[in-house]
């Protein structure tokens, strides 16, 4: 597998992308930011635009809104128009937050065009963000899409590199976080090969 990295940057760059930092695309910017490309300057991460502000694309609008007819509009207002064909920035840094994918540079939302209004996504269905998935699921990347995946249970591997990533294809398979009452911790093991393996473990009460 080969990835074309023309439009993305390293995790370190992405993690540091805040207002004013340079970007190549919206995915380079953290949550509530988008990649603004002024005519005579280099593109930079700018704060998302609120309701009724002018926009050219969904990523320019703050979470919960999208760009309809060049204006940031609430999802409820836009749903009948777009049949939920949405594409909105949702770049929350998610480590340790139940129900979010375990990955440093969480990508933008992926649409689901035919879900009936109000119905939550099931496992394997396309999603926009975790809100669109049913209980016990989160919205996470799988290959070139985002789908609803189960939140991790006790004993399940939660390492960032839990999947067979390759040098050419890092982090194209996101995992959800550990479920409620669980933390992602290194597994105590005598086998040095698995020393870095992290699993979901119960939070010990003090």
């Amino acid at each position: 597998l080969v990835l074309d990295f023309n439009n993305i940057r390293s995790s370190a760059d992405l993690h540091g992308a805040r207002k004013g930092s340079q970007c190549l695309s919206d995915t380079d910017c953290n949550t509530r930011k988008f990649c603004l490309q002024p005519r005579d300057e280099k593109p930079f991460c700018a704060t998302c635009r609120g309701l009724r502000r002018r926009c050219q694309r969904d990523a320019m609008c703050c979470p919960g809104t999208l760009c309809v007819n060049d204006v940031c509009t609430t999802m409820e207002d836009a749903t009948p128009i777009l049949e939920r064909q949405l594409d909105e920035q949702d770049g929350t840094h998610a480590e340790g937050t139940t129900g979010h994918p375990v990955q440093e540079n969480q990508p933008k939302r992926k649409p689901s065009i035919k879900k009936s209004q109000g119905r939550k996504g099931q496992e394997g269905e396309s999603c926009l963000r975790t809100f669109d998935c049913g209980p016990g699921l989160c919205c996470a990347r799988h290959f070139w899409t985002k789908i609803c995946k189960p939140v991790l249970l006790e004993g399940q591997v939660c390492s960032r590199r839990g999947h067979k990533d390759t040098a050419q294809a890092p982090e194209i398979f996101q995992r959800c976080d550990c479920g409620p009452g669980l933390l992602c911790r290194s597994q105590l093991t005598s086998n040095r090969q698995h020393a870095r393996l992290r699993v979901c473990q119960k939070i010990e009460k003090l």
């Epitope: 993305i8 396309s126 799988h142």
Partner: antibody
Framework: EVQLVESGGGLVQPGGSLRLSCAAS????????ISWVRQAPGKGLEWVAS??????????YYPDSVKGRFTISRDNAKNSLYLQMNSLRAEDTAVYYC???????????WGQGTTVTVSS | EIVLTQSPATLSLSPGERATLSCRAS??????????INWYQQKPGQAPRLLIY???KQGSGIPARFSGSGSGTDFTLTISSLEPEDFAVYYC?????????FGGGTKVEIK
């Protein structure tokens, strides 16, 4: 209604080039991943290339069998997907389908296909 | 890469009969609590059509007579009662690992 219509197939000599197109309609094209899958005569299906939607930075993906020879690209303004095929070989002879992943992670909508024949 | 082996290569049945198609993976295609296996139907001269994804979930507009089951490495597509339009080639596909791969197909023909 979701529609994918491929074009650009034809007869080409080994070592030659061809550019396939896929015109999409019925959905917000730029938001979705879209792929090329091929099928050699009388054979099974083989994934050829994919490009993610705007939310994942339009990243491109290829199997080893075509990497360096094929290039997938998209023109979101024209709702079109392309496959530039260079250094074509006899084994690239196939029907080429474009397929998209709208409702789930699988290839849930397909075009009717366009035939590419590589022969001298 | 993950190799998918479908059996039988050909299944000869009559309308109304039950069809059971098998797909075996060279390694587990389960991850994140999901079986990343899909089933497609293809009729002569037509594009494939998604029947089942995530092992057992029906694609849009797929009749209830089509069902998928299995986990790990062994998966089954069942057509509870064959209709005349069901005679076609069926492919399984894995989308757990890169590259995505397809099985060789099972042809369901009229006996």
């Amino acid at each position: 209604e979701v529609q994918l219509v491929e074009s650009g197939g034809g007869l080409v000599q080994p070592g030659g080039s061809l550019r396939l197109s896929c015109a999409a309609s019925g959905f917000t094209f730029s938001s979705y991943a879209i792929s090329w899958v091929r099928q050699a005569p009388g054979k099974g299906l083989e994934w050829v290339a994919s490009v993610s939607g705007t939310g994942l930075g339009f990243q491109t993906y290829y199997p080893d069998s075509v990497k360096g020879r094929f290039t997938i690209s998209r023109d979101n303004a024209k709702n079109s997907l392309y496959l530039q095929m260079n250094s074509l070989r006899a084994e690239d002879t196939a029907v080429y389908y474009c397929a998209t992943s709208l409702e789930n992670y699988a290839f849930d909508y397909w075009g009717q296909g366009t035939t590419v024949t590589v022969s001298s | 890469e993950i190799v998918l082996t479908q059996s039988p290569a050909t299944l000869s049945l009559s309308p109304g009969e039950r069809a059971t198609l098998s797909c075996r993976a060279s390694e587990s295609v389960d991850d994140f609590g999901i079986s990343f296996i899909n089933w497609y139907q293809q009729k002569p001269g037509q594009a494939p059509r998604l029947l089942i994804y995530a092992g057992s979930k029906q694609g849009s507009g797929i009749p209830a007579r089509f069902s998928g089951s299995g986990s790990g490495t062994d998966f089954t597509l069942t057509i509870s009662s064959l209709e005349p339009e069901d005679f076609a080639v069926y492919y399984c596909q894995q989308l757990k690992e890169v590259p995505p791969t397809f099985g060789g197909g099972t042809k369901v023909e009229i006996k």
